[in-house]
Interface confidence: low
Amino acid sequence: EDGGPACYGGFDLYFILDKSGSVLHHWNEIYYFVEQLAHRFISPQLRMSFIVFSTRGTTLMKLTEDREQIRQGLEELQKVLPGGDTYMHEGFERASEQIYYENSQGYRTASVIIALTDGELHEDLFFYSEREANRSRDLGAIVYCVGVKDFNETQLARIADSKDHVFPVNDGFQALQGIIHSILKKSCIEILAAEPSTICAGESFQVVVRGNGFRHARNVDRVLCSFKINDSVTLNEKPFAVEDTYLLCPAPILKEVGMKAALQVSMNDGLSFISSSVIITTTHCSDGS
């Protein structure tokens, strides 16, 4: 097996996992799917949470960027004994609680939810799940659903952001491994580089922001480039162009040599941000250079 793709995006990733009785003999497949997917999100700024649901929702691992805690969280996930009903809405409630708390602490980090279930939701449970998923969306989250075996794709398309945000696994749990590449590609929003990364002090510039997933936004008109200058002032700029692998953005005019602007991207008009390690710095440019 080759290394496969990875995601360098800095955001908050929530796994909401079905541990109802119907997955009793398939929990290992779910676990290995999460384990392999989790370790492909490699940004030091990425935080992750594991939530399981059956008759109630449980936060198995609170949001953390600590790789040792994530390792321990995966160990806990492996020990889960499935059983109970499919109260998916309880899982979304646990995610929304954390997103709300993080927002209240002043963190405006983008949230991505990957929810996995194996069964059709009974009418009232579907209503609750859609309602709670909408609440997560209102808090700024992007919602993806993975459906395995006996799922209802129409239901999941309404729980997720759209039909394009649903990953159907029709060949049973063993086929979960086969969607890792596609789910990573679709759920990953990452900033990889800025061109140019050094700009002339006091001059106006356009910056090409290289990355992936910029068109995963529900509405590309809400995509913003954000420049956090010298760890203090943040300036948001509307891009001239939004493509999946790059943004063309006006750079703020940075008057002094040595100023630094950390690059972020918002997919929702500034409600929350994808962070990165990409920095734009200013330098002195002599006339005619």
Epitope: G3, E35, H39
Partner: antibody, heavy 126, light 109 residues
Framework: QVQLVQSGGGVVQPGRPLRLSCAAS????????MSWVRQAPGKGLEWVSA????????YYADSVKGRFTISRDNSKNTLYLQMNSLRAEDTAVYYC???????????????????WGQGTTVTVSS | SSELTQDPAVSVALGQTVRITCQGD??????ASWYQQKPGQAPVLVIY???NRPSGIPDRVSGSRSGNTASLTITGAQAEDEADYYC???????????FGGGTELTVLG
Amino acid sequence: QVQLVQSGGGVVQPGRPLRLSCAASGFNLGSYAMSWVRQAPGKGLEWVSAISGSGGSTYYADSVKGRFTISRDNSKNTLYLQMNSLRAEDTAVYYCAKILGPGNLNYYYYYGMDVWGQGTTVTVSS
Amino acid sequence: SSELTQDPAVSVALGQTVRITCQGDSLRNSYASWYQQKPGQAPVLVIYGNNNRPSGIPDRVSGSRSGNTASLTITGAQAEDEADYYCNSRDSSGNHVVFGGGTELTVLG
């Protein structure tokens, strides 16, 4: 503090065995995949062997396969390298190292080795 | 023969920028890590996962990967940067680990 302390090196005759030990402190050895790397005098680093956190998966370089055995005793927080049928070309400084990332070495990703032992010299000579 | 190829020696003037490269097909599908080794000492991890610096490594050291080439860049080289540098990744099979042949960095001046 996280560290690896090695022992067991020395001078040994060709064809004879030797066992190297690597004691971990400051972290739970069983949570991490581990590796042995060697460096012949004046040469570069050469990967020798690796083992998963549970000890269930082991891997060897072609140059030592069938002669060397990597093992671990997680209750003692210690990693071992049993070297049999030693040859002159096995003369090197041997390092144990902790592998970054998941303890399951069947995993897709290998990020690097973040903690190294101090090294122990093995000289194979008649 | 090593699956990862490095230039045997590179020199840089004090305070200047130097880039050490590592080539190999395995790098297309795996991460590169970089180690610094000074005479008589154990290697020290300076970059992991292509471009991540462990704590304690100065930010003038950076890493990147493009296609089958990984690069280690030292900006504003200091005398203490003089050492051997090795790249490392999983091999093409994914079951072995492989090191580059090493690059001896000399800081001039």
